[in-house]
Amino acid sequence: TSHLVKCAEKEKTFCVNGGECFMVKDLSNPSRYLCKCQPGFTGARCTENVPMKVQNQEKAEELYQK
């Protein structure tokens, strides 16, 4: 089984644009990293800009779910 832990200080730069870094701890596989991106960014390392249209759509969906 695997679980997520927050990255150590020295690993945080795996993600860019202020993305929050998590390490996937898995006993049977090497460690790998995931990023939770800031609003406006996407991609494996938060390098991609989300088009404004999509951002607005996401906000609308978020409000609807609330």
């Epitope: 690993e11 730069t13 991609g43 494996a44 390392r45 390098t47």
Partner: antibody
Amino acid sequence: EVQLVESGGGLVQPGGSLRLSCAASGFTFSGTWIHWVRQAPGKGLEWVAAITPADGSTNYADSVKGRFTISADTSKNTAYLQMNSLRAEDTAVYYCATYMFAMDYWGQGTLVTVSS
Amino acid sequence: DIQMTQSPSSLSASVGDRVTITCRASQNVDRSLAWYQQKPGKAPKLLIYAASSLESGVPSRFSGSGSGTDFTLTISSLQPEDFATYYCQQHYTLPFTFGQGTKVEIK
């Protein structure tokens, strides 16, 4: 042992094209982030482009956007930089580098000279 | 783009000296700051990343500090092999940008 070997540099006329290669070994290529950085003669370092081989996402410096294309072939563990519409100011040593938490491994560089 | 400004642009020092190089970012880069060493005709070599993390295999005389916009690279006791050019680089946001370099020369 991690190794990055660039090739494809040379002399080209303004407006011409070149394709640089970066052959990688010693690590999981598809799981990394590959960058190209250049250095004009006697000058500092300039970031050029990056690619995530796993999903093909790319990023470019404004100075090369629309002229340069970065790509990767995971079956060959090789990244490429296709350079079109070359200008005199593109003259530089071009390095490829891997990025885990910073640019940790670099190739030896390949010289591109744009001159008539 | 984030501008990176290094100082000094060059310095002369003797073996055994303590050397400090500073780097300032034009906007907040948190702790996403790396330092590289480059010798003539060679590729840059990573020394420090995430502002203060020492890259594997790099001697402990090298250290980094800072966060936000102001950063420092310190060489506690300069060795003959340390004479080189040093670059800072922000790796907080693309495009990644480098300082103009600091050349450390023999006095």
